[in-house]
C-alpha cells in the first residue's frame, strides 16, 4: 500500500492528478462508522468541508482525497478529521512550464559519481493500476527503452549521462487522459571517494646497519581500499632467502580511508644487502608513490649527512 502523505508542506504542478492520504488509514478502517471529514481553507476563508459535490475534480475515498487534476485554485490548507485525530497539510500548486516537458521547481536533484551504479526507475505505485504507459525522457527527448510500463536505466555512470530525466506516466480516469511527471536532475561528478595514495615519511631513507644483524624496514601509506602496496628490490627480486615480506596490516581511518603498513625484514645482513635500493610502492588507479631505503654500514655513517638517516 502507498505510504501516507506525512509531509506538512507540499508543492505540486497544476494539471496533474494528485492525492493526499492521511496517516491513520489503518485505524480508519477499524472504525468504519466513525465520521471522517476533509476540509479546506484558503487565505481568510473558513474551513469548508469537501465532498464530491464541491468539485467534479475531487474524489473522496476511505483514506484519500484525490484531485483529477489539481489546479492553481486548489492552493491552501487541507485538514483531515476523524474523532480526535486531525492531520493538516499546506498545499502549494504552481504553474506548469508550458515550454518544457517539466517544471524546474519540481525537480529532484541527484549527484552520481562517475563509474558508480546509476539507476532511474519510472514507478508510481499509487496510480499503477490506472497507468496505460510510461515514457522516460532525457532533456525532453524520449528515450527508446524496452519496457513501456516501467522504463528503467541501470548502468555505471558516465559523464554523458548528466541531464534532466523525466518519467511521464499516462493514465485514464473517467474517460480523460492525464499525465504525471517526475523529473530528476542528474549531475555526474568525479569520483570523490578516492585519494591519491601517499607513502608516509621521507622518500629516501639511509638506514645504518651492522653486518650479521637484522633490520625491519617499515613502509606506511595512506591509501584507498583497492590500492596495493608492495616492495621491489634488485632486478631479480626475491633472490635473497634472508629477505621476508611480512603480512600487510591495515587500519581504517575515521575518513573511511586506509592506513597500511608493510614491513620488509632483512635477516643476517650481508655485503650484498648494502647500497642497494629497496623500493616500497603504493599504487592506485589515480597514481603511485615510491619511497626508497638504502642500507649503509654503521662504520660508513660519517660519509653521509645526518639528516638523511633513519635509525
Amino acid at each position: 500500500a502507498e505510504s501516507c502523505t506525512s509531509r506538512p508542506h507540499i508543492t505540486v504542478v497544476e494539471g496533474e492528478p494528485f492525492y493526499l492520504k492521511h496517516c491513520s488509514c489503518s485505524l480508519a478502517h477499524e472504525i468504519e462508522t466513525t465520521t471522517k471529514s476533509w476540509y479546506k481553507s484558503s487565505g481568510s476563508q473558513e474551513h469548508v468541508e469537501l465532498n464530491p459535490r464541491s468539485s467534479s475534480r475531487i474524489a473522496l475515498h476511505d483514506c484519500v482525497l484525490e484531485f483529477w487534476p489539481v489546479e492553481l485554485n486548489d492552493t491552501g490548507s487541507y485538514f483531515f478529521q476523524m474523532k480526535n485525530y486531525t492531520q493538516k497539510w499546506k498545499l502549494n500548486v504552481i504553474r506548469r512550464n508550458k515550454h518544457s516537458c517539466f517544471t524546474e521547481r519540481q525537480v529532484t536533484s541527484k549527484i552520481v559519481e562517475v563509474k558508480k551504479f546509476f539507476q532511474i526507475t519510472c514507478e508510481n505505485s499509487y496510480y499503477q493500476t490506472l497507468v496505460n504507459s510510461t515514457s522516460l525522457y532525457k532533456n525532453c527527448k524520449k528515450l527508446l527503452l524496452e519496457n513501456n510500463k516501467n522504463p528503467t536505466i541501470k548502468k555505471n555512470a558516465e559523464f554523458e549521462d548528466q541531464g534532466y530525466y523525466s518519467c511521464v506516466h499516462f493514465l485514464h480516469h473517467n474517460g480523460k487522459l492525464f499525465n504525471i511527471t517526475k523529473t530528476f536532475n542528474i549531475t555526474i561528478v568525479e569520483d570523490r571517494s578516492n585519494i591519491v595514495p601517499v607513502l608516509l615519511g621521507p622518500k629516501l631513507n639511509h638506514v645504518a646497519v651492522e653486518l650479521g644483524k637484522n633490520v625491519r624496514l617499515n613502509c606506511s601509506a595512506l591509501l584507498n581500499e583497492e590500492d596495493v602496496i608492495y616492495w621491489m628490490f634488485g632486478e631479480e627480486n626475491g633472490s635473497d632467502p634472508n629477505i621476508h615480506e611480512e603480512k600487510e596490516m591495515r587500519i581504517m581511518t575515521p575518513e573511511g580511508k586506509w592506513h597500511a603498513s608493510k614491513v620488509l625484514r632483512i635477516e643476517n645482513i650481508g655485503e650484498s644487502n648494502l647500497n642497494v635500493l629497496y623500493n616500497c610502492t603504493v599504487a592506485s588507479t589515480g597514481g603511485t608513490d615510491t619511497k626508497s631505503f638504502i642500507l649503509v654500514r654503521k662504520a660508513d655513517m660519517a660519509d653521509i649527512p645526518g639528516h638523511v638517516f633513519t635509525r
Partner: nanobody, 115 residues
Framework: EVQLVESGGGLVQPGGSLRLSCAAS????????MGWYRRAPGNQRELVAW???????GNKNSVKGRFTCSRDNAKNTVYLQMNSLKPEDTAVYYC?????????WGQGTQVTVSS
C-alpha cells in the same frame, strides 16, 4: 577504459601446474610493467611475480623458482606459469600494472590447491 580479464584458475593437487592468462580490452599493456597479485582469504593483495615492458621477469621469495611471468604484446596478454603448486598458493589471482598507476581490478581467477 581498460578492463582486465583473468582466466585459467581452477582446482589442482599439490605439486600440480596451472597457466593463468590475463587479457586487456579497451587499452594496451604495451610499455607497461605487468604483474600478478594474489589475495588469500583474510589478506590484502600481494604482488607475487612480474614482467617488465622489456621482458625482464622477477618474483617473490615465496614463489621463487615455481612461478614465471611471460607476455605476448601482440595479443595484449600476460601469463603466469605456476608449477609445483602448494596449498598456501590458494588465492584469487589478479593481473595489473607494476611500477605505475594500476588499472581497475578485474574479477580475478580462483586458484585452489588441495588434495
Amino acid at each position: 577504459e581498460v578492463q582486465l580479464v583473468e582466466s585459467g584458475g581452477g582446482l589442482v593437487q599439490p605439486g600440480g601446474s596451472l597457466r593463468l592468462s590475463c587479457a586487456a580490452s579497451g587499452g594496451s599493456f604495451s610499455g607497461k610493467d605487468m604483474g600478478w597479485y594474489r589475495r588469500a582469504p583474510g589478506n590484502q593483495r600481494e604482488l607475487v611475480a612480474w614482467i617488465t615492458s622489456i621482458g625482464i621477469t622477477g618474483n617473490k621469495n615465496s614463489v621463487k623458482g615455481r612461478f614465471t611471468c611471460s607476455r605476448d604484446n601482440a595479443k595484449n596478454t600476460v601469463y603466469l606459469q605456476m608449477n609445483s603448486l602448494k596449498p598456501e598458493d590458494t588465492a584469487v589471482y589478479y593481473c595489473n600494472v607494476v611500477n605505475g598507476p594500476i588499472f581497475p581490478w578485474g574479477q580475478g581467477t580462483q586458484v585452489t590447491v588441495s588434495s
